[in-house]
Structure formats: structure tokens, C-alpha cells
């Protein structure tokens, strides 16, 4: 049997034998044109396509449309993987989408969606969610049903102000909604009663900004 | 630093008074709006009364319509919840919390609670004889 050295997503990666978490090299669907992801092989079976990662504040995420579209940071680090790559991927099986969050007291929580897509770029790609599982709240912080993907240069939210530039960081903001993940990092002890920061409502709930975020993504049928 | 600060809590009897004040600091009302919330035992937070555009625009839940009033000094940076009338019913922790005013719905005049994210400690009025 011939090997495969061309991979989708961090699943066939695992299921390829390469099962040890770092840096791997994707394939764009239907195309020779390649992109760098984390892939987590330790998380709850392995084999996560990591798409958003913050941790520490080292990368600025109030960045344009284009760099939302095609990924921005570093894999090792803080890292947005791209809209483009993630709609092409989600629009082809059947994904869940896991977001697994920490607070600055030590806690820890996830919210899992049983189907996640993007929709393309014509529709400013719009987020689908269902199925939420998970210990990071009962309700969806992510506002149902899904909204358009909204920046600094392109404001597609339902809000009478432009809520990318308002709350900082790309996101698909309602109006402006229960969470952005992509907001301004702050520190401990000066994460609170803050207007634009990264926030999860239905966990942690108001002007809460987190410590870490990881938004991970793996075939449903893994 | 953001900053909200309730006070003038306190035990009053059934048909009595109080004015609540909420002090806002590391930012200026003129682009907020202000609500005010209560928490009683057991029950879920709710909103009570909000005010924006130097109280332009003020809104009252049903249950305190033509009895308590908000209004605001943006000189002093400060909003008042004057309570009358009030009855056992009333007992809650009051908390003020603040919201960006833009932050609007297209269509709608007030904000979800998520769209609050600063928030004072609480002031706590009894209302018992």
C-alpha cells in the first residue's frame, strides 16, 4: 500500500502513525497549496486540528480580513490557522469543534459542538454550530444561530456599532454577543470588568478575560 | 481601571425610600450606559432600570414602573436609583454595571446582560418591617 504524504487535517495525520502533538503541514482540499498547523495527538483520542490559539498575549489578533483568511502567528504559540483553509476543510465532512478554555484561578472548561462549519467567503464565513456539550457553559457563548466572521476592515455584525473595532480581535460577533476569543489580552489581576477583552460569557461570565484558549477541530467520525 | 461603586443600601421599612448611588471611575458616562440589577436569594440576576445618552434614554422593568426612578451627574460621574414605594418583594442585593452605549442591536433600544461587562460589588436592600 502506497503511504500517504499528503494530509487534510491532523486526523489522518494520527491515523497516518504520527501520533506525537507539534507542528504538521496540511493540504488544502482539492489543491497542491499547503499550510502549517499545531495538531494535538494527546487530546481526548488525539488527532485535533488546532485553529485558534492564545496563551500568553505575544501576538496582536486585531488584525484585517485578509490575515484572518489566511492565518496569522505561529503553530508553536498564539495562532489564528485561517478561514479559508478551515471552510474549505469543514465544508468537505463532518467536524466537531472543542474550545477548551482556562481561567486565571487555575480552572479549566470546554464547550464541544457535535457538527461546526464555515461557510465561504461569499457569505463572510458564517459559523454553524450545533450540539453543545461540555463543562464551560449549558448555553452557547457563541450566539445561535451563527453569525458572520466580522474585523477591523469589514464589519458584518448586527450591532449599530462596528464591534471588531469596539471589543478589538476578529470574530463572529452578534451585537455584539457572548464571547470573542480574539480580543485584547490582559494579565492576571487586570482581567476583569473589561469591555474587550477574551471572553466567554456562559462560563466565566461579564468583562472576564481569559488566560488561554485553544479552538481545535477533528472529523466527526474519528 | 474600570471602576463601579454602589452604596446607600440599607433596611427600610415597607412604603419607605432609598436612593442608591453607583460611582463610576476609568471611564465617562457620556459614552456608556449605566443599568442597574438586583439579585435576591435563590433567584436569577434581572434588570431593573439602565440609562444612556445623559439620560436621554432611560428604561424600567414592570415591576418598578412609577416607583423607582434613574437618573445621572456626569459631572460627578455618578447614576442614582431613587426608590420608593418599596415592598418586601424589593429585597435584593443591587448591583450597577455598565455597557459601552453603541453597543446596540440594529432595531432594539437595550443590551442583553452579556453585553454588560463592568460590574460594582452590590449594595444590599432590605426591605422588612
Known amino acids: 500500500k502506497e503511504e500517504q504524504t499528503t494530509f487534510r487535517d491532523c486526523a489522518e495525520i494520527f491515523k497516518s502513525g504520527l501520533t506525537t502533538s507539534g507542528i504538521y503541514t496540511l493540504t488544502f482540499p482539492n489543491s497542491t497549496e499547503e499550510i502549517k498547523a499545531y495538531c494535538d495527538m494527546d487530546v481526548g483520542g488525539g488527532g485535533w486540528t488546532v485553529i485558534q490559539h492564545r496563551e500568553d498575549g505575544s501576538v496582536d489578533f486585531q488584525r484585517t480580513w485578509k490575515e484572518y483568511k489566511e492565518g496569522f502567528g505561529s503553530p508553536l504559540g498564539e495562532y489564528w490557522l485561517g478561514n479559508e483553509f478551515v471552510s474549505q476543510l469543514t465544508g468537505q465532512h463532518r467536524y466537531v469543534l472543542k474550545i477548551q478554555l482556562k481561567d486565571w484561578e487555575g480552572n479549566e472548561a470546554h464547550s464541544l459542538y457535535d457538527h461546526f462549519y464555515l461557510a465561504g467567503e461569499e457569505s463572510n464565513y458564517r459559523i454553524h454550530l450545533t450540539g453543545l456539550t461540555g463543562t464551560a457553559g449549558k448555553i452557547s457563548s457563541i450566539s445561535q444561530p451563527g453569525s458572520d466572521f466580522s474585523t477591523k476592515d469589514s464589519d458584518n455584525d448586527k450591532c449599530i456599532c462596528k464591534c471588531s473595532q469596539m471589543l478589538s480581535g476578529g470574530w463572529w460577533f452578534d451585537a455584539c454577543g457572548p464571547s470573542n476569543l480574539n480580543g485584547q489580552y490582559y494579565p492576571q489581576k487586570q482581567n476583569t470588568n473589561k469591555f474587550n477583552g477574551i471572553k466567554w460569557y456562559y462560563w466565566k461570565g461579564s468583562g472576564y478575560s481569559l488566560k488561554a484558549t485553544t479552538m481545535m477541530i477533528r472529523p466527526a467520525d474519528f | 481601571e474600570v471602576q463601579l461603586v454602589e452604596s446607600g443600601g440599607g433596611l427600610v421599612q415597607p412604603g419607605g425610600s432609598l436612593r442608591l448611588s453607583c460611582a463610576a471611575s476609568?471611564?465617562?458616562?457620556?459614552?456608556?450606559?449605566i443599568g442597574w440589577f438586583r439579585q435576591a436569594p435563590g433567584k436569577e440576576r434581572e434588570g431593573v432600570s439602565a440609562?444612556?445618552?445623559?439620560?436621554?434614554?432611560?428604561y424600567y422593568a414592570d415591576s418598578v414602573k412609577g416607583r423607582f426612578t434613574i437618573s445621572s451627574d456626569n459631572s460627578k460621574n455618578t447614576v442614582y436609583l431613587q426608590m420608593n414605594s418599596l415592598r418586601p418583594e424589593d429585597t435584593a442585593v443591587y448591583y450597577c454595571?455598565?455597557?459601552?452605549?453603541?453597543?446596540?442591536?440594529?432595531?432594539?433600544?437595550?443590551?442583553?446582560?452579556?453585553?454588560?461587562?463592568?460590574w460594582g460589588q452590590g449594595t444590599l436592600v432590605t426591605v422588612s418591617s
Open positions: 454595571a455598565a455597557v459601552p452605549a453603541g453597543r446596540l442591536r440594529f432595531g432594539e433600544q437595550w443590551y442583553p446582560l452579556y453585553e454588560y461587562d463592568a
Open positions: 476609568g471611564f465617562t458616562l457620556d459614552d456608556y450606559a
Open positions: 440609562i444612556r445618552d445623559n439620560g436621554g434614554s432611560t
